[in-house]
Interface confidence: medium
């Protein structure tokens, strides 16, 4: 279950620096498709975008507030921190963090939001916010089996690929013939690439995936690779060489 939770002081004094923490769970900030944004809403007013950060550490800031804002990710990959300097009473607002669904190249929309935290700026007493940190991550290993196999024309061939952690359906299969560029067969675990014969099919989700060739043809003798696209760095399986029997 995806959750985002904002924490920070409920009250800051004018000229002070505000530090807000967004603690996320149910997804990883190292996931290639994700980002986190901060948005605020003064009482009774519209939403205002402040800043965002993506898994590759790409950042962007509101033009009008750029000089006052800093956004960063905690190395634990579970927290995004926003600091805002030189606070003023007009900065009193509910501050939200939200997840950005980012499809690699084209940043898109906010699909999950935190509940928001109201920050008041006045010369009254101060408050404090907290936030912990979680564990780090590691590269996803893709284990293909078998590494080689002999088969005959007409055979049904099944190749498996196991991910070391859940990658949802972010898996593609490629065919590579000697001296040639890899050719994509399957994307999103089970979607057939346009122009690829229907004897190829893919299935699976989470950690277990299968490429099936229902009836092998002579041109199918090649090496097949799986590739995970869930988290940076993207990683390939070690390959399965399908050779002619005898």
């Amino acid at each position: 279950q995806v959750t985002l939770k904002e924490s920070g002081p409920v009250l800051v004094k004018p000229t002070e620096t505000l530090t807000l923490t967004c603690t996320v769970s149910g997804f990883s900030l190292s996931n290639a498709r994700m980002g986190v944004t901060w948005i605020r809403q003064p009482p009774g007013k519209a939403l205002e975008w402040l800043a965002h950060i993506f898994s590759n550490d790409e950042k962007s800031y509101s033009t009008s507030l750029k000089s006052r804002l800093t956004i960063s990710k905690d190395t634990s990959k579970t927290q995004v921190v926003l600091t805002m300097t030189n606070m003023d009473p007009v900065d009193t607002a509910t501050y939200y963090c939200a997840r950005i669904r980012d499809y690699y190249d084209i940043s898109s929309y906010y699909d999950y939001w935190g509940q928001g935290t109201l920050v008041s700026v006045s010369s009254g007493g101060g408050g404090s916010g907290g936030g912990g940190s979680g564990g780090g991550g590691s590269d996803i290993q893709m284990t293909q089996s078998p590494s080689a196999m002999s088969a005959s024309v007409g055979d049904r061939v099944t190749i498996t690929c196991r991910a070391s952690q859940d990658i949802s359906n972010y898996l593609a299969w490629f065919q590579q013939k000697p001296g040639k560029v890899p050719k994509r067969l399957i994307y999103a675990a089970s979607s057939l690439q346009s122009g690829v014969p229907s004897r190829f099919s893919g299935s699976g989700s989470g950690t277990e995936f299968t490429l099936t060739i229902s009836s092998l043809l002579p041109e199918d003798f090649a090496t097949y690779y799986c590739l995970q696209l869930n988290s940076f760095p993207f990683t390939f399986g070690g390959g399965t060489k399908v050779e002619i029997n005898g």
Epitope: Y104, D105, I106, A172, Y187, L227
Partner: antibody, heavy 119, light 111 residues
Framework: EVQLQQSGPELVKTGTSVKISCKAS????????IHWVKQSHGRSLDWIGS????????TYNQKFKGKVTFTVDTSSSTAYMQFNSLTSEDSAVYYC????????????WGQGTLVTVSA | DIVLTQSPASLAVSLGQRATISCRAS??????????LHWYQQKPGQPPTLLIY???NLESGIPARFSGSGSRTDFTLTINSVEADDVATYYC?????????FGGGTKLEIK
């Protein structure tokens, strides 16, 4: 038609650097990252990283960080990958790739650039 | 910055009637064949909820009475057959160009 045209083979000496290119054509480049992949002889593939034509934002596989540098020249629709301090381990075919419009990467590939590092 | 102008600022409709909210961008929010314009619903005291992404795609779990249309600079959110539960403020948002921006909001009330 989407095309990724890579520069020709390179024979370089150990300790030197090499810069290979990937020229994109047939589509509006700003919407897409270029991804780079390494394939050592007879081995599997390694994703090196990616760079955005839109704003030059890069993502590197930690394994290659400090070893490679990505750049883009939007005026010529060309992405570059520079390899520094080359060793025999860097001898490989390097591919550039681009996602398809289904939001998955590597629907399109360059033809590959063979880099041979010799003493 | 891209300015998003929503109209009307507030809207009162009868239950079962259709509500139409407009969002006009100061420049095109289309790129690569997509419109990077999204719609959110916000009820008092709650964070916004995504309704429609990329102009016309209904977010999972959102009732089919909500629909979005438009391209380039002119977009519309339509609620067919308004229900009492739809009383909220609706915002459009663009993510085509940094900095991302929101419209000023449209408050929907029941007549």
């Amino acid at each position: 038609e989407v095309q990724l045209q890579q520069s020709g083979p390179e024979l370089v000496k150990t300790g030197t650097s090499v810069k290979i290119s990937c020229k994109a054509s047939g589509y509006s480049i700003t919407g897409y990252y270029i991804h780079w992949v390494k394939q050592s002889h007879g081995r599997s593939l390694d994703w090196i990283g990616s760079i955005s034509f839109y704003n030059g934002a890069t993502t590197y596989n930690q394994k290659f960080k400090g070893k490679v540098t990505f750049t883009v020249d939007t005026s010529s629709s060309t992405a570059y990958m520079q390899f520094n301090s080359l060793t025999s381990e860097d001898s490989a075919v390097y591919y550039c790739g681009r996602r398809g419009d289904d939001y998955d990467v590597f629907a399109y590939w360059g033809q590959g650039t063979l880099v041979t590092v010799s003493a | 910055d891209i300015v998003l102008t929503q109209s009307p600022a507030s809207l009162a409709v009868s239950l079962g009637q259709r509500a139409t909210i407009s969002c006009r961008a100061s420049e095109s929010v289309d790129s690569y064949g997509y419109s990077f314009l999204h719609w959110y619903q916000q009820k008092p005291g709650q964070p916004p909820t995504l309704l429609i992404y990329r102009a016309s795609n209904l977010e999972s779990g959102i009732p089919a009475r909500f629909s979005g249309s438009g391209s380039r600079t002119d977009f519309t959110l339509t609620i067919n057959s308004v229900e009492a539960d739809d009383v909220a403020t609706y915002y459009c948002q663009q993510s085509n160009e940094d900095p991302w921006t929101f419209g000023g909001g449209t408050k929907l009330e029941i007549k």
